[in-house]
């Protein structure tokens, strides 16, 4: 006996072949003997089954011995053994439909889990294998769990379910609402304007819900919301701002925040969270600003940076076009009595330069 | 609701090859013809040849010499070439989904083929 | 191979009129044959399928029959929308074929 797989909703062609290449006599029936479809004549006529006005022939071939059977938006209930009568002889399908869906929405939030359940035919034991786009493999039975959905689950999830040596291949689409970035770290001179910007990893038809930046200034004791916003339909609109520092906010996606100037005193890491609407838990995108200072006071040369610096990070004083160079992994260099001449101050991680100020020393008579 | 969208090169040379693919979004693949048939234009239409999911095809006989129809079934995608193409060629080219009638229709692509 | 001849090949009428289309087969094709629409710069559209059933969608106005080799489509009221071009198509045996179409005009 054949056994075909079929998938709940789509279409089957069940095949059924005679040895000589000609229109002849043909039926199928389904296991109880009940007549689907046959031929009289040239017609094709349909039987009292549940299936037949879902049922169908392609005559043109026919004239090439073959009678196959297709069944339309195919349902789990249609699992049976299928007959095809031809030329004295029968032949037996056993067709077994199933089904994969996920069990809650398919546009889920980072961190949030995944159950995609298998509907089977009664006395079928099918083993399931998912694979994630980012190429995770899953397997199981009934159900397949993803306890945390990564950035990265986001896209077609490929699933391949496996019954007596044959399979069947489901695609779900998974959406996974996140940031672009968990995090990201912006590096600025004091007194420049600064640009942050909240790219989504994901796009929406319509996009709904609210926002807020809270704020940890390095040399502050508590943290505070700089900013409350709303999103409506990709639309931006801004509730509650500071007064200090005043952010001004883009009117359209990406979400995007201008703080007028990098200062010391904002150096340091903020929480952007959005609320979806119609969505439990809310997106999050860390974001950091570090400020470079570098000051020239009497005798003393001093560069500095505010805000969160990896240990790893140097900072340099270093005289252009000369030898003469400071460094150290610390917040704070400075040069005694400088030479004359334009000064750099560098932050840099493993030789990449993220941060530089250049300040003028110029000669005391 | 299923949907066919289809596109290729709009202008040919006369012996080149004619390149044309159809994506089907939105319903199933296997179970179901896919056909492509072309239209010159001002006249009727004239059907090309069909393919199934797992690969089987049939040609008009008219064609059969310089048409291949593949099909690519992890794309949920089915392809026309027709070699050796001639001014006579010139046509708008739909691909449509069948068991034994056409239903629904790509947009058409029209194809020139002129030196 | 099949033959399909349509008649007229094209035919004038007004809002209202029941116009009738003939489509004849160069041998039986039992009710193997469909019928489309066709409006200028669109694929066409499938309108009667097995020569009499109506493709879900399609205004009642619209009709199929016949079997063997003569076939007719019948719009009973002629609507502004109704004005394009009709086929029809045999699915008896490969190749496929079409009727040459039969314009319906503005009187």
């Known amino acids: 006996k054949k056994v075909v797989l079929g998938k709940k909703g789509d279409t089957v062609e069940l095949t059924c072949n005679a040895s000589q290449k000609k229109n002849t006599q043909f039926h199928w029936k389904n296991s109880n003997q009940i007549k689907i479809l046959g031929i009289q004549g040239l017609f094709l006529t349909k039987g009292p089954s549940k299936l037949s006005d879902r049922a169908d022939s392609r005559k043109s071939l026919w004239d090439q011995g073959c009678f196959s059977m297709i069944i339309k938006n195919l349902k789990i209930e249609d699992s049976d053994t299928y007959i095809c009568e031809v030329e004295n002889k029968k032949e037996e399908v056993e067709l077994l439909v199933f089904g994969l869906t996920a069990n809650s929405d398919t546009h889920l939030l980072e961190g949030q889990s995944l159950t995609l359940t298998l509907e089977s035919p009664p006395g079928s034991s099918p083993s399931v294998k998912c694979r994630s786009p980012g190429g995770k493999n899953i397997q199981g039975g009934r159900t397949i769990s993803v306890p945390q959905l990564e950035r990265q689950d986001s896209g077609t999830w490929t699933c391949t379910v496996s019954q007596d040596q044959k399979t069947v291949e489901f695609k779900i689409d998974i959406v996974v609402l996140a940031f672009q970035k968990a995090s990201s770290t912006v590096y600025k001179k004091e007194g420049e304007q600064v640009e942050f910007s909240f790219p989504l990893a994901f796009t929406l038809e319509k996009l709904t819900g609210s926002g807020e930046l809270w704020w940890q200034a390095e040399r502050a004791s508590s943290s505070k919301s700089w900013i409350t916003f709303d999103l409506k339909n990709k639309e931006v609109s801004v509730k509650r701002v500071t007064q200090d520092p005043k952010l001004q906010m883009g009117k359209k996606l990406p979400l995007h925040l201008t703080l007028p100037q990098a200062l010391p005193q904002y150096a340091g890491s903020g929480n952007l969270t959005l609320a979806l609407e119609a969505k439990t838990g809310k997106l999050h995108q860390e974001v950091n600003l570090v400020v470079m200072r570098a000051t020239q006071f009497q005798e003393n040369l001093t560069c500095e940076v505010w805000g969160p610096t990896s240990p790893k990070l140097t900072l340099s004083l270093k005289l252009e076009n000369k030898g003469a160079t400071v460094s150290k992994q610390a917040k704070a260099v400075w040069v005694l009595n400088p030479e004359a001449g334009m000064w750099q101050c560098l932050l840099s991680d493993s030789g990449q330069v993220l941060l530089e100020s250049n300040i003028k020393v110029v000669p005391t008579w | 609701q299923v949907q066919l969208q289809q596109w290729g090169a709009g202008l040919l040379k006369p012996s080149e090859t004619l390149s044309l693919t159809c994506a089907v979004y939105g319903g199933s693949f296997s179970g179901y013809y896919w056909s492509w048939i072309r239209q010159p234009p001002g006249k009727g239409l004239e059907w090309i040849g069909e393919?199934?999911?797992?690969?089987?095809?049939n040609y008009n006989p008219s064609l059969k010499s310089r048409v291949t129809i593949s099909v690519d079934t992890s794309e949920n995608q089915f392809s026309l070439k027709l070699n050796s193409v001639t001014a006579a060629d010139t046509a708008v080219y739909y691909c449509?989904?069948?068991?034994?009638?056409?239903?629904?229709w790509g947009q058409g692509t029209l194809v020139t083929v002129s030196s | 191979e099949i033959q399909m001849t349509q008649s007229p090949s094209s035919v004038s009428a007004s809002v209202g009129d029941r116009v009738t289309i003939t489509c004849r087969a160069s041998?039986?094709?039992?009710?193997?044959l469909a019928w489309y629409q066709q409006k200028p710069g669109k694929a066409p559209n499938l309108l009667i399928f097995?020569?009499?059933s109506l493709q879900t969608g399609v205004p009642s106005r619209f009709s199929g029959s016949g079997s063997g080799t003569d076939f007719t489509l019948t719009i009973s009221s002629l609507q502004p929308d109704d004005f394009a071009t009709y086929y029809c198509?045999?699915?008896?045996?490969?190749?496929?074929?079409f009727g040459q179409g039969t314009n319906l005009g503005i009187k």
């Open positions: 449509a989904r069948l068991v034994n009638w056409f239903d629904p």
């Open positions: 393919i199934n999911h797992s690969g089987s095809t």
């Open positions: 041998q039986d094709i039992s009710n193997w």
């Open positions: 198509q045999q699915a008896n045996s490969f190749p496929y074929s």
């Open positions: 097995a020569a009499s």
